[in-house]
C-alpha cells in the first residue's frame, strides 16, 4: 500500500484526504494542516513547510480545527437579554449560555440571543414538561383528574386533591381542577360562611 501523504502535499482535485484536519491552499495547490481547537495559524503553510499553530491567548478561543489567523474573543452571556452562564469560555469553546430560570428562548441565531419571561398558566392548568428547559414558551395543559392548581404561575404544578378520609375527615365539597377538596369534621356541619380547605 502507498504511504499516506503528510501535509503539505499536492492536490490536483482541490480536495484533501482529511477534511476535518486539513484544508486546500489554492495559491500553492497543496493540502495543509488545520490548527487544532484552542490554537490559530501563526505561520501559513508553503510547499516545503506545514502550517505553524500557536495557542490562543487568554480570553480567546477557537472551537474547531481551523485555518484562522486569529482566535475569537470570549464574550460573557448577556444578562440584559435574559441569559446566564452555565460554563466558562476556554481556549477550545465559547461561553455556554442558557435562559435564566423562568424564561424561554425567544430569538435563535445559531444560539439563543434573547430570552423572555415564560407565560403564566392559569388556575386549573400547568406547564407541559419539556425535554429541555428554556427551549420554548409554556404550553399549558389541564390538570389531570384528581388534581388541582389554584394560581396563575409559569411553574406551579398540579397537586393531588386532599383525601379527607386519610385525615379522619369527611368531604364537604369535592375538589375541582382549580381548587382542593374541602374537608370537615364528620361530627360537625359546615357553617355556610366557612370555605377553608381544612376545617378541624
Amino acid at each position: 500500500s502507498q504511504p499516506q501523504a503528510v501535509p503539505p502535499y499536492a492536490s490536483e482535485n482541490q480536495t484533501c484526504r482529511d477534511q476535518e484536519k486539513e484544508y486546500y491552499e489554492p495559491q500553492h495547490r497543496i493540502c495543509c494542516s488545520r490548527c487544532p481547537p484552542g490554537t490559530y495559524v501563526s505561520a501559513k503553510c508553503s510547499r516545503i513547510r506545514d502550517t505553524v499553530c500557536a495557542t490562543c491567548a487568554e480570553n480567546s478561543y477557537n472551537e474547531h480545527w481551523n485555518y484562522l489567523t486569529i482566535c475569537q474573543l470570549c464574550r460573557p452571556c448577556d444578562p440584559v437579554m435574559g441569559l446566564e452562564e452555565i460554563a466558562p469560555c476556554t481556549s477550545k469553546r465559547k461561553t455556554q449560555c442558557r435562559c435564566q430560570p423562568g424564561m424561554f428562548c425567544a430569538a435563535w441565531a445559531l444560539e439563543c440571543t434573547h430570552c423572555e419571561l415564560l407565560s403564566d398558566c392559569p388556575p386549573g392548568t400547568e406547564a407541559e414538561l419539556k425535554d429541555e428547559v428554556g427551549k420554548g414558551n409554556n404550553h399549558c395543559v389541564p390538570c389531570k383528574a384528581g388534581h388541582f392548581q389554584n394560581t396563575s404561575s409559569p411553574s406551579a404544578r398540579c397537586q393531588p386533591h386532599t383525601r379527607c378520609e386519610n385525615q379522619g375527615l369527611v368531604e364537604a365539597a369535592p375538589g375541582t381542577a382549580q381548587s382542593d377538596t374541602t374537608c370537615k369534621n364528620p361530627l360537625e356541619p359546615l357553617p355556610p360562611e366557612m370555605s377553608g380547605t381544612m376545617l378541624m
Epitope: 487568554e58 480570553n59 460573557p76 448577556d78 444578562p79 452555565i86 460554563a87 476556554t90 481556549s91 455556554q96
Partner: antibody, heavy 116, light 107 residues
Framework: QVQLQQSGPELVKPGASVRISCKAS????????LHWVKQRPGQGLEWIGW????????QYNEKFKGKATLTADKSSSTAYMQLSSLTSEDSAIYFC?????????WGQGTTVTVSS | DIVMTQSQKFMSTSVGDRVSVTCKAS??????VAWYQQKPGQSPKSLIS???YRYSGVPDRFTGSGSGTDFTLTITNVQSEDLAEYFC?????????FGSGTKLEIK
C-alpha cells in the same frame, strides 16, 4: 504583572455584615472575570461566585445566594464582596482570583473572624 | 454539582521519589481541570490547567494527565519544598468545584 491586593483581616460580631475588597492591577480590569473562593481553617476550597466588571454582572453558587453580594467599581479597578447575617460558619479566609482555565492569579486572602 | 474526589487525604514520600496525586470527577469534565499547590498560610498557587498544561515558572517535575473523569498530578524527583497540600478543580461547568485536598508529607 497581574496583581490582586485584598483588604486586611476583619473581626465582626454574629449577625453583622462585612465588606472585603480586591484591588486589581496589571491587566484590563473590565475584560476578565473575578471570582471569590472560601476556605475554612483546615478545610477545602469552595467557589462562591464571580463578577464580570465589564457589565458588573455577578453569578453565584446557589449555596451562597443571599449570603454573598459581589460588586465592582471600574474606576478604581476594585471588586468587593459583602457577606451578611454572619455566623461562626462564615469564619474563613476569602480569596479573590482571576480566571482563565482555572485560577492562574490569586489574592493573598482576607481572614474574616465572626465572634461575639 | 460535580464532585471532585481526592481519595487520599495524606501521602508520605521521600526526597527524590515519585508520587501521584489522583482526582476523580463525578461526571465527564473533558480536560477542564486545574491543579493547585497550597502551603500553610499562603494562597493556592496554580500548577496545571487543561489537565496537563504546566504554567510557566512551574518546575517540570510537576506533570498533569487525564481526561473525562480521572486525573493525576505526578511529582517526579520530589523536593522538600513540595511539602504542601494539592487541590484539583473542575472548571467545566458552574458551580466550579474543588477536591478536598491531598497533603504531601516528606519523610
Amino acid at each position: 504583572q497581574v496583581q490582586l491586593q485584598q483588604s486586611g483581616p476583619e473581626l465582626v460580631k454574629p449577625g453583622a455584615s462585612v465588606r472585603i475588597s480586591c484591588k486589581a492591577s496589571g491587566y484590563t480590569f473590565t475584560t476578565y472575570y473575578l471570582h471569590w473562593v472560601k476556605q475554612r481553617p483546615g478545610q477545602g476550597l469552595e467557589w462562591i461566585g464571580w463578577i464580570y466588571p465589564g457589565n458588573v454582572h455577578a453569578q453565584y453558587n446557589e449555596k451562597f445566594k443571599g449570603k454573598a453580594t459581589l460588586t465592582a467599581d471600574k474606576s478604581s479597578s476594585t471588586a468587593y464582596m459583602q457577606l451578611s447575617s454572619l455566623t461562626s460558619e462564615d469564619s474563613a479566609i476569602y480569596f479573590c482570583a482571576r480566571s482563565w482555565e482555572g485560577f492562574p492569579y490569586w489574592g493573598q486572602g482576607t481572614t474574616v473572624t465572626v465572634s461575639s | 454539582d460535580i464532585v471532585m474526589t481526592q481519595s487520599q487525604k495524606f501521602m508520605s514520600t521521600s526526597v527524590g521519589d515519585r508520587v501521584s496525586v489522583t482526582c476523580k470527577a463525578s461526571q465527564n469534565v473533558g480536560i477542564n481541570v486545574a491543579w493547585y499547590q497550597q502551603k500553610p498560610g499562603q494562597s493556592p498557587k496554580s500548577l496545571i490547567s487543561s489537565a496537563s498544561y504546566r504554567y510557566s515558572g512551574v518546575p517540570d517535575r510537576f506533570t498533569g494527565s487525564g481526561s473525562g473523569t480521572d486525573f493525576t498530578l505526578t511529582i517526579t524527583n520530589v523536593q522538600s519544598e513540595d511539602l504542601a497540600e494539592y487541590f484539583c478543580q473542575q472548571y467545566d461547568t458552574y458551580p466550579f468545584t474543588f477536591g478536598s485536598g491531598t497533603k504531601l508529607e516528606i519523610k
